[in-house]
């Protein structure tokens, strides 16, 4: 399956627009940083076949939606805003839902990728215990905006990597 | 390969104005911070302030605001730092380094090989 | 503003030699501690970050320790190319600022 353009034009798009979402000073919130531990390996495209790779990608696009789609998030961020990072993730979860199902059978992708994609939730389960430690307080929220931000232009870097290769 | 390359050196009058700069290459430039760091002659580092370049939003330390200002050009990954009015105390190396933000990542990774500003009259 | 204290200001040592350095700051700053090496005419290197973390490609006789207010650098076998000034800084919160340094002589 080669990633269409228009999947990496809207990963640049969320990544702009998560940059847009900030409301307050991030030089307050240094000493909130947190070591999310992001799971690095689970997208190496060396290691992992591309199949692994692209369901890690749906998984942590689907994650990040259920995390943004929270009403602590709708309290924290501009609704417009937020409305059209909510479009962009739906897009992109249909574009790499095609690309799944094309490189692998239905079936199989449950059982191949599990590792991946439960490494990906546990990524965001400590996001979320981080988020509810901090009283999902508005520094808490702008480190995991800047955290969101760093794993999708990993990802976006990858996916250009995956189109190379066909 | 992650580069900060730093304006050259700078011989000035006292009252004079300069700006000095630091390009980012290798990297995202929007993704890390610059931060700007003064060493006078013989002396230790001070941390004078910091940009963010996505938006150009910064920070000084008490003792430089008012005194300089940063600034950045993300369309040229380029950050400065400025005098409106120099003073012979400004005499020093100045470097700049990256700064990860809010990230969990090394802080100033990265050094500028500093600009050299002697202000003399 | 957070006072990063260190100590010695200067010290002798020889080639192979244990040598530690602290760093202590005024109010507790967690693990958001650096250290890093300057010697003449060059910019500083970071070494350690977030107090214990090795930087990649740093040698591994460097280490750091520490949590709080109280921090150590140390170097286990002092090598020739080591004889530098060491800084540490803290990233807790702005202002950032530095130690004042402690300067590695050859004894």
């Known amino acids: 399956c080669d990633l269409p353009q228009t999947h990496s034009l809207g990963n640049r798009r969320a990544l702009i627009l998560l940059a847009q979402m900030g409301r307050i000073s991030h030089f307050s919130c240094l000493k909130d940083r947190y070591d999310f531990g992001f799971p690095q390996e689970v997208f190496d495209g060396n290691q992992f076949q591309k199949a692994q790779a692209i369901s890690a990608f749906h998984e942590m696009i689907q994650q990040t939606f259920n995390l943004f789609s929270t009403k602590d998030s709708s309290a924290a961020w501009d609704e417009t805003l937020l409305d059209k990072f909510y479009i962009e993730l739906f897009q992109q979860l249909n574009d790499l839902e095609a690309c799944v199902t094309q490189e692998v059978g239905v079936e199989e992708i449950a059982l191949m990728n599990e590792d991946s994609i439960l490494a990906v939730r546990k990524y965001f389960q400590r996001i979320t215990l981080y988020l509810m430690g901090k009283k999902y307080s508005p520094c808490a929220w702008e480190v995991v905006r800047a955290e969101i931000m760093r794993s999708f232009s990993f990802s976006t870097n990858l996916q250009k990597g995956l189109r190379r290769k066909d | 390969e992650v580069q900060l390359v730093q304006s050259g050196a700078e011989v000035k009058k006292p009252g004079e104005s300069l700006k000095i700069s630091c390009k980012g290459s290798g990297y995202s430039f929007t993704s890390y911070w610059i931060g700007w760091v003064r060493q006078m002659p013989g002396k230790g580092l001070e941390w004078m302030g910091i940009?963010?370049?996505?938006?150009?939003?910064?920070a000084y330390s008490p003792s430089f605001q008012g005194q300089v200002t940063i600034s950045a050009d993300k369309s040229i990954s380029t950050a400065y730092l400025q005098w409106s009015s120099l003073k012979a105390s400004d005499t020093a190396m100045y470097y700049c380094?990256?700064?990860?933000?809010?990230?969990?990542?090394?802080?100033?990774?990265?050094w500028g090989q500093g600009t050299l500003v002697t202000v003399s009259s | 503003d957070i006072q990063m204290t260190q100590s010695p200001s200067s010290l002798s040592a020889s080639v192979g030699d244990r040598v530690t350095i602290t760093c202590r700051a005024s109010q507790s700053i967690a693990d958001f501690l650096n250290w890093y090496q300057q010697k003449p005419g060059k910019a500083p290197k970071l070494l350690i970050y977030f107090a214990s973390s090795l930087q990649s490609g740093v040698p591994s006789r460097f280490s750091g320790s520490g949590s709080g207010t109280d921090f150590t650098l140390t170097i286990s076998s002092l090598q020739p190319e080591d004889f530098a000034t060491y800084y540490c800084q803290q990233s807790h919160s702005f202002p950032l600022t530095f130690g004042q340094g402690t300067k590695v002589e050859i004894k």
């Open positions: 940009i963010d370049p996505s938006d150009s939003d910064t």
């Open positions: 380094a990256r700064h990860p933000g809010l990230n969990w990542a090394p802080d100033f990774d990265y």
